[in-house]
């Protein structure tokens, strides 16, 4: 099976100056030791074995390599150097591979489990001897490292000074190309088929390709506006209608086949329009209303569908009352007109203001434009009325109005009536036809860059920091508000203030904690810990003081009290030969005069008998919630998610590579990022449209309303459908446009907008 990731170790240097084995013997195995005359030049044939296992606070070199193991070929003699990992080394190795060479110093250990981040690494240098299998006699050096590493491309350098040899190497963990996360157990492989249409982002999340959506990016994004209740799509950009629905957006029901003067709300209905009946709404129930067949004032009565009867007034007869008998008997002339019988029937003589065959038409008295001064004429029965502009009155707007009666002047002493107008006498500070505009009294009175605010017949200066007074002419004490943090001293200046910060702080307000350990002030090898506005030096046993520069008296108050010497007597009068082990496994006993002793402790241990491991975590060196693990003469920080580095003080840039789509700007956060989206976009990575509506969403002047992930069109009169593309007009019912054409109706006429590949009046 394919690995989830790889642990890579690149050996870059090994120095075995004496060319000896860990046992002290020479590599060539002829019994010589370094002490007995030294070993020869390049006697060792050095190769390296690597063992990777679970994290052990106290490393045990034995036991299985539970995470994997590997080995190099023979890399060189007593000492050798290889190109280091990183850019320069990668180039050198690429050249070597191009020449057909393998990379000798690289050990790659694949793993098929979630990377646990913590690990133990044991590196052994061996002398190769083709006569023997590896045994402890041929071991040159064994070094170990227990720690934590996150998957990334960067290499981490490790240096080891062993008993015999010095090793330099780099390590890293990399996820396989389709695995992601800090543990390499999140699988994502880009694909573009029915199982999903996606690429993978930097975190291994599926990023849908254009036109696809859903958790697995299998669902097609249908045409915008498609009514997903009655339609859908299997490929992007389509809108395929369910049975019984039609139209570009599947928002029109299919009426009953052959339905003439009817419509549907649900498919296969034929709901008749007013005055139409029958299964197909093709029977005219109001022949009278739609055809008006009865003439000469005859009354029409609807009979059976498509049938009618005329009841004729006196003097008329015929199916449609078209035959005149005694025409004037029925007083056909309206509005006081006089009737005269003529051979064809009758004639009406109309009074003033009326016209037409029966004096039913009102004559337009506004035709002569009687209204003066731009007045609007309204025709009335036998007359007219003028609607005058504000400044004029009278029947034909010929008289000047007194505008002052309406009190138009707002901030004035008086109002004067003029011909066709008026005049307002303004109070100081106001201007305009109605004294409604405040005069700008600001004319550069404010000093020292003050901002002028206009008032009624006056002004006010808004002064910059450090100034006051009516014209900002007075200097203010900026230090009065104690703006300096961390005990900084404030100095008032002409244009503000300046903070003089105490040691350990900087910034305009002394708000920045300076790293006082750069460069380290600690002496005699003491470790420096940066504190807020201060630092702490962890002094070795024999030095004290703030900077560990003061030597300590090893035995305060006099000579050390004798417990025992460094040796124990083997018998009376015999010198001390056997070590008593008083200094334990981490100290060396030094005999002093008078039977006294002192213990010289190994690095990392302290106390009279070197039994105490110095707690290197005391200064809480791990930042940002990192967990500190004390080790011998060292500590290790296990960082929380989102932080890395030896002290958990490095926040990796989550904006690389840029996760923001649609020109969004990325801001790096802790183990996260924020995309500031461009106008019109939203979502974690600016991948969603902010607004569903644009100028083209609703047709025919419809108003679009955004409702989250969809939209609604409010249609103007005469239009319906989800995008106002369906005419209510009967000229489009039933739809005369075939082959998917869209009908656009206007009154009794219509036109068809045909789909690609079709043309003609009805897209035939």
């Amino acid at each position: 099976a394919r690995p989830m990731g790889y642990f890579e170790l690149q050996l870059s240097a090994l120095r075995n100056v004496n060319g000896e084995l860990l046992s002290g013997a020479c590599c060539d195995g002829d019994g010589r030791t370094t002490r007995a005359g030294g070993c020869g030049h390049d006697e060792c044939d050095t190769y390296v074995r690597v063992c990777l296992k679970e994290y052990q606070a106290k490393v045990t070199p034995t036991g299985p390599c539970s995470y994997g193991h590997g080995a190099t070929p023979v890399l060189g003699g007593n000492s050798f150097y290889l190109p280091p990992a990183g850019a320069a080394g990668d180039r050198a190795r690429a050249r070597a591979r191009a020449g057909g060479d393998q990379d000798p110093g690289l050990v790659v250990i694949p793993f098929q489990f979630a990377w646990p981040r913590s690990f133990t690494l044991i590196v052994e240098a061996w002398d190769w001897d083709n006569d023997t299998t590896p045994n402890e006699e041929l071991l040159i050096e064994r070094v170990s490292h227990a720690g934590m590493i996150n998957p990334e491309d960067r290499w981490k350098s490790l240096h080891f000074s062993g008993h015999v040899a010095h090793l330099e190497l780099q390590i890293r963990v990399r996820c396989d190309e389709n695995y992601y996360s800090a543990t390499c157990n999140k699988f994502c492989r880009p694909r573009n088929d029915f199982f999903g249409h996606y690429t993978c982002d930097q975190y291994g999340n599926k990023a849908c390709m254009d036109g696809w959506m859903g958790k697995e990016c299998k669902e097609a994004v249908c045409k915008q506006g498609c009514n997903l209740l009655h339609g859908g799509c299997t490929v992007p950009g389509e809108c395929r209608c369910s049975y019984g629905w039609q139209g570009r957006f599947c928002d029109e029901c299919v009426p009953y086949p052959g339905c003439v003067h009817g419509s549907c709300v649900e498919p296969w209905q034929c709901n008749c329009e007013t005055n139409w009946g029958g299964l197909l709404c093709d029977k005219d129930l109001n022949y009278c209303g739609s055809h008006h067949p009865c003439t000469n004032g005859g009354t029409c009565i609807n009979a059976e569908p498509d049938q009618y009867r005329c009841t004729c007034p006196d003097g008329y007869s015929g199916r449609n009352c078209e035959k005149a008998e005694h025409a004037c008997t029925s007083n056909p002339c309206a509005n006081g007109g006089s009737c005269h019988e003529v051979p064809s029937g009758f004639e009406c003589h109309c009074p003033s203001g009326w016209s037409g065959p029966t004096c039913a038409l009102d004559i337009d008295e506004c035709a002569s434009n009687p209204c003066a001064a731009g007045g609007t004429c309204v025709d009335q029965v036998d007359g007219f009325e003028c609607i005058c502009p504000e400044q004029w009155v009278g029947a034909t707007c010929q008289l000047d109005a007194n505008e002052c009666e309406g009190k138009p002047c707002l901030n004035a002493f008086s109002c004067k009536n003029l011909i066709g107008g008026y005049y307002c006498d303004c109070i100081p500070g106001w201007k305009g036809i109605n004294c409604h505009i405040n005069v700008n009294d600001c004319r550069g009175q404010c000093q020292h860059g003050g901002t002028c605010k206009d008032l009624v017949n006056g002004y006010q200066c808004v002064c910059p920091r450090g100034f006051g007074g009516r014209h900002c002419e007075l200097e203010r004490d900026e230090c009065a508000s104690s703006p300096c943090h961390s005990g900084g001293l404030c100095e008032d200046l002409a244009d503000g203030f300046h903070c003089h910060c105490p040691q350990g702080f900087s910034g305009p307000l002394c708000e920045v904690d300076v790293d006082l350990c750069e460069p380290s002030p600690c002496r005699n090898g003491a470790r420096c810990y940066n504190l807020e506005g201060d630092y702490y030096c962890a002094c070795p046993d024999d030095f004290g003081g703030k900077n560990c520069s003061v030597p300590r008296e090893p035995c305060p108050g006099g000579a050390c009290r004798v417990i025992d010497g460094c040796g124990s007597d083997a018998g009376p009068g015999m010198p001390g030969t056997a070590a008593s082990g008083v200094c334990g496994p981490h100290g060396r006993c030094v005999s002093q005069p008078g039977g006294n002793f002192s213990c010289i402790c190994d690095s990392g241990f302290t106390g009279t008998y070197c039994h105490e491991n110095i707690d290197d975590c005391l200064g809480q060196p791990c930042r940002n919630g990192g967990t500190c693990i004390d080790e011998v003469d060292a500590f290790r920080c296990f960082c929380p998610s989102g932080w890395e580095g030896e002290l958990c003080d490095t926040n990796p840039n989550d904006c690389l590579p840029d996760p923001c789509h649609s020109r969004g700007r990325c801001y790096d956060l802790v183990n996260d990022f924020y995309c500031a989206c461009d106008d019109g976009w939203k979502g974690k990575t600016c991948h969603s449209r902010e607004f569903q509506c644009d100028a083209y969403t609703c047709s025919n002047g419809g108003t679009c309303y955004d409702s989250g992930d969809t939209f609604r069109c409010a249609c103007p009169p005469g239009w319906k459908g989800s995008t106002c593309a369906v005419a209510k007009n009967s000229s489009c019912l039933p739809n005369p446009c075939v082959n998917g054409g869209t009908c656009v109706g206007s009154g009794a006429s219509f036109s068809c907008i045909c789909r690609d590949g079709w043309e003609g009046r009805t897209c035939t």
Epitope: A1, R2, N178, F187, C188, R189, P190, R191, N192, D193, F194, F195, G196, T199, E216, K218, A220, T234, V235, E238, R240
Partner: antibody, heavy 123, light 107 residues
Framework: EVQLVESGGGLVQPGGSLRLSCAAS????????IHWVRQAPGKGLEWVGG????????DYANSVKGRFTISADTSKNTAYLQMNSLRAEDTAVYYC????????????????WGQGTLVTVSS | DIQMTQSPSSLSASVGDRVTITCRAS??????VAWYQQKPGKAPKLLIY???FLYSGVPSRFSGSGSGTDFTLTISSLQPEDFATYYC?????????FGQGTKVEIK
């Protein structure tokens, strides 16, 4: 050499169950999809369903959804088709096939097929 | 589901003939089309993938073309071993679907 070997076919009564296995060898099992395709006697090919062993993602034909389940054991390099509530119309030769996929090429096709195993549903 | 309609359903041809089989998709399937050859009692064999790419080991007399909804498999010079049934298959949207097959017989 790439090989896919189906097993587990046989005669079963309507409403019964059967489990087919597809043992894969000669390639990295988690780098490919495994599909099940069936062919009724004298008829054409019909896709039944598929699995991506690397992440366990599955998909099924509408005709078998809710009755058939596809799974994979990456330690054994084997895919399984669990068939429940079998009907007479499920009678067919069942093939398992390997499908490579790549974002750069669509429709990469099923490049290796097993020899097929016959499933007969009859009373 | 997307329908894949093959034509003709069967054809008779002689050795050396140029044979063309077409496959029409009911909707746009990009270039996600593969072609297979199947002989009686045997499993299908992949010939063409991604509409026009020849699968390794397949003779160069086989070729494929098309995109969107119309696809073609062409055998430039029919050989005795080419008499078989040919299927097209789309893998653009779920479920993947096969054509009904085209049987190529000896005239």
């Amino acid at each position: 050499e790439v090989q896919l070997v189906e097993s587990g076919g046989g005669l079963v009564q309507p409403g019964g169950s059967l489990r087919l296995s597809c043992a894969a060898s000669g390639f990295t099992f988690t780098s490919y999809d495994i599909h099940w395709v069936r062919q009724a006697p004298g008829k054409g090919l019909e896709w039944v369903g598929g699995i991506s062993p690397a992440d366990g993602d599955t998909d099924y034909a509408n005709s078998v959804k809710g009755r058939f389940t596809i799974s994979a054991d990456t330690s054994k390099n084997t895919a399984y088709l669990q068939m429940n509530s079998l009907r007479a119309e499920d009678t067919a030769v069942y093939y398992c096939a390997r499908n490579d996929y790549d974002v750069r090429s669509v429709g990469s096709g099923m490049d290796y097929w097993g020899q097929g195993t016959l499933v007969t549903v009859s009373s | 589901d997307i329908q894949m309609t093959q034509s003709p359903s069967s054809l008779s041809a002689s050795v050396g003939d140029r044979v063309t089989i077409t496959c029409r998709a009911s909707q746009d399937v990009s270039t996600a089309v593969a072609w297979y050859q199947q002989k009686p009692g045997k499993a299908p064999k992949l010939l063409i993938y991604s509409a026009s790419f020849l699968y390794s080991g397949v003779p160069s007399r086989f070729s494929g073309s098309g995109s969107g909804t119309d696809f073609t498999l062409t055998i430039s010079s029919l050989q005795p071993e080419d008499f078989a049934t040919y299927y097209c298959q789309q893998s653009w949207t779920a479920p993947p679907t096969f054509g009904q097959g085209t049987k190529v017989e000896i005239k």
